[in-house]
Interface confidence: medium
């Protein structure tokens, strides 16, 4: 059976959009007007994976483009990264566990836990035009929660 | 062409049981994570239970869970509920869904869906 997936745009609870920064980077800023047609459209499929009524594997694909995030460790950090793949090969609904993000509904909003390393979240810092970043805290500085909007394919 | 055929359904007491079956056909059946939702009197419809394809894992929603068990049979492309304690507030028209895919969690997509068959539980 093909893989679902749906288009979606990601804001985080300051409202903070998110945009390409270079090739391999996404960074979170606010948006107003007409700039907000810079923000990143994700191509979100539901993949194979732990789930339970409030958590759903997903998979985060940039769309139209064969890139996707994934967690990998760096000098010894799971770190958050965009990683280009084949892409007659994805998505697929047994997509290798670090494009797998454990997609968590908590009080209408939305966590992004990493499968590959537990408890790291996709996170973004309070400052503005930082980078996304998989951080290792929830509830601190940075921001973990995040809405989804729907977009139309 | 998908068909999706519903039965099962009828008048139970509460604290009754009855198990619906869907008979699938047109598609490739054990490729396809399968479901129910149903539609009560007045209401939206509702994500009851589904279970993944090769059927090793299932999920129910908070209202069912104990009380209904998801199944299935490849080899007869048969998709089935066991509802146990019904209590009134299940009365609702049963439906199948193929491909049926959790989104969030009041949120589910799905390709197709039967015609339906309707569950009254009532004394």
């Known amino acids: 059976a093909p893989v679902r997936s749906l288009n979606c745009t990601l804001r985080d609870s300051q409202q903070k959009s998110l945009v390409m920064s270079g090739p391999y980077e996404l960074k979170a800023l606010h948006l107003q007007g007409q700039d907000m047609e810079q923000q990143v459209v994700f191509s979100m499929s539901f993949v194979q994976g732990e789930e339970s009524n409030d958590k759903i594997p997903v998979a985060l694909g940039l769309k139209e483009k064969n890139l996707y995030l994934s967690c990998v460790l760096k000098d010894d950090k799971p770190t958050l990264q965009l990683e280009s793949v084949d892409p007659k090969n994805y998505p697929k609904k047994k997509m290798e566990k670090r494009f797998v993000f454990n997609k968590i509904e908590i009080n209408n909003k939305l966590e992004f836990e990493s499968a590959q390393f537990p408890n790291w979240y996709i996170s973004t810092s309070q400052a503005e035009n930082m980078p996304v970043f998989l951080g290792g805290t929830k509830g601190g500085q940075d921001i973990t929660d995040f809405t989804m909007q729907f977009v139309s394919s | 062409e998908v068909q999706l055929l519903e039965s099962g359904g009828g008048l139970v007491q509460p604290g009754g049981s009855l198990r619906l079956s869907c008979a699938a056909s047109?598609?490739?059946?054990?490729?396809?994570?399968m479901g129910w939702v149903r539609q009560a009197p007045g209401k939206g419809l509702e994500w009851v239970s589904s279970?993944?394809?090769?059927?090793?894992?299932?999920y129910y929603a908070d209202s069912v869970k104990g009380r209904f068990t998801i199944s299935r049979d490849d080899s007869k492309n048969t998709l089935y509920l066991q509802m146990n304690s019904l209590r009134a507030e299940d009365t609702a028209v049963y439906y199948c869904?193929?491909?049926?895919?959790?989104?969030?969690?009041?949120?589910?997509?799905?390709?197709?869906w039967g015609q339906g068959t309707l569950v009254t539980v009532s004394s």
């Open positions: 047109g598609f490739t059946f054990e490729d396809y994570q």
């Open positions: 279970i993944s394809a090769m059927g090793n894992r299932t």
């Open positions: 869904a193929e491909n049926l895919v959790k989104i969030s969690r009041r949120h589910w997509m799905f390709d197709y």
